[in-house]
């Protein structure tokens, strides 16, 4: 493969299994020089952009997308892309967000830590969830459906 731009990676903090009403932050990472990170909900037509990009390391930049209070409608696959002028990157692999009812039981952890999808791993083997259009990014009102977006 010829690869002009490295694929971004996506991870979720504190994990990909989030109790209803709790917060989750998606972290998108790419090379230095990224101008815009985009978090897409399943397809390219539903996304949230940010230019609030920070340097994670000498060779890597990142952006964070927080959902303050997750609902069942937030469940589903998410992926990242970035714009490093003058090009958009390929998408990251998908990361599947699972939202669970809070059980309160001490034997069931609230999250799966360290969940990520990036250029060095196979697509995650999570079953596909049927889901309604969901919110992502900072708050529900920050969700945008776009037909032509770049």
């Amino acid at each position: 493969q010829e690869e002009d731009l490295p694929r971004p990676s996506i991870s979720a903090e504190p994990g990909t299994v989030i109790p209803l009403g709790s917060h989750v932050t998606f972290v998108c990472r790419g090379p230095v020089g990224v101008q815009t990170f985009r978090l897409e909900r399943e397809s390219r037509s539903t996304y949230n952009d940010t230019e609030d990009v920070s340097q994670a390391s000498p060779s890597e930049s990142e952006a964070r997308f927080r959902i303050d209070s997750v609902s069942e409608g937030n469940a589903g696959p998410y992926r990242c892309i970035y714009y490093k002028p003058p090009k958009w990157s390929e998408q990251s692999d998908y990361l599947e967000l699972l939202v669970k009812e809070t059980s309160g039981g001490p034997d069931s952890p609230d999250t799966e830590p360290g969940s990520s999808a990036g250029p060095t791993q196979r697509p995650s083997d999570n079953s596909h969830n049927e889901h309604a259009p969901a919110s992502q990014g900072l708050k529900a009102e920050h969700l945008y459906h776009h037909h032509h977006h770049h």
């Epitope: 397809s43 990157s89 697509p123």
Partner: antibody, heavy 121, light 111 residues
Framework: EQSLEESGGDLVKPGASLTLACTAS?????????MCWVRQAPGKGLEWIGC???????IYYASWAKGRFTISKTSSTMVTLQMSSLTAADTATYFC??????????????WGPGTLVTISS | ELVMTQTPASVSEAVGGTVTIKCQAS??????LAWYQQKPGQRPKLLIY???SLASGVSSRFRGSRSGTEYTLTITDLECDDAATYYC?????????????FGGGTEVEIK
């Protein structure tokens, strides 16, 4: 309306080279689509050749196609497939396809009508 | 190398019946699986994407499902217009393995 059109199909002799073109209209390559080539021999199934990401430039090939087939983006509306050392087994209809604008997981939603390549002496 | 093994190669069923087509991936491909319908002399048409999601304008008689690395296309209440060849495809293009491979196709004949 969004569309793809293949061109360049021809009757050529074994050992020859040929370049096919796929011209896009109604959408922008800068949006970052997977532009793919798929072929179908007469009476046979679909066979994936490879894809290029129209913005980043990343290219992916089927293992059997590496070396003899080259996919390139030659303009903001055109992708090409260069084929060399052609044999009778390469006789097929060659399709250009693009992944979806509105669906996730990269399915080929938009297809051209195909162009016929015949290899015969 | 990723291989998609599609079965059966052909099937014949009466109008109103049900056809089940299976596609086995040689490795984990998550939900990067699409199903297409192709009629003679025509370009393929997308039916199912993401293993189980129905493309716009496609009849709900077509249903996709997944169990591990086995994917299934089920066509219920068969109509004459369903006579065609159906293909699965892995739609993952990435750095760990190269997707893109199609299954061998299933020709559906309506009695």
């Amino acid at each position: 309306e969004q569309s793809l059109e293949e061109s360049g199909g021809d009757l050529v002799k074994p050992g020859a080279s040929l370049t096919l073109a796929c011209t896009a209209s109604g959408f922008s390559f800068s949006d970052g689509y997977y532009m793919c080539w798929v072929r179908q021999a007469p009476g046979k199934g679909l066979e994936w050749i490879g894809c290029i990401h129209s913005s980043s430039g990343s290219i992916y090939y089927a293992s059997w196609a590496k070396g003899r087939f080259t996919i390139s983006k030659t303009s903001s509306t055109m992708v090409t497939l260069q084929m060399s050392s052609l044999t009778a087994a390469d006789t097929a209809t060659y399709f250009c396809a693009r992944d979806s604008e509105s669906y996730g997981y990269n399915p080929c939603e938009l297809w051209g009508p195909g162009t016929l390549v015949t290899i015969s002496s | 190398e990723l291989v998609m093994t599609q079965t059966p190669a052909s099937v014949s069923e009466a109008v109103g019946g049900t056809v089940t087509i299976k596609c086995q991936a040689s490795q984990t491909i998550s939900n990067y699986l699409a199903w297409y319908q192709q009629k003679p002399g025509q370009r393929p048409k997308l039916l199912i994407y993401a293993a189980s999601s129905l493309a716009s304008g496609v009849s709900s008689r077509f249903r996709g499902s997944r169990s591990g690395t086995e994917y299934t296309l089920t066509i219920t209440d068969l109509e004459c217009d369903d006579a065609a060849t159906y293909y699965c495809q892995c739609t993952y293009y990435g750095t760990t393995y190269i997707g893109g491979a199609f299954g061998g196709g299933t020709e559906v004949e309506i009695k």
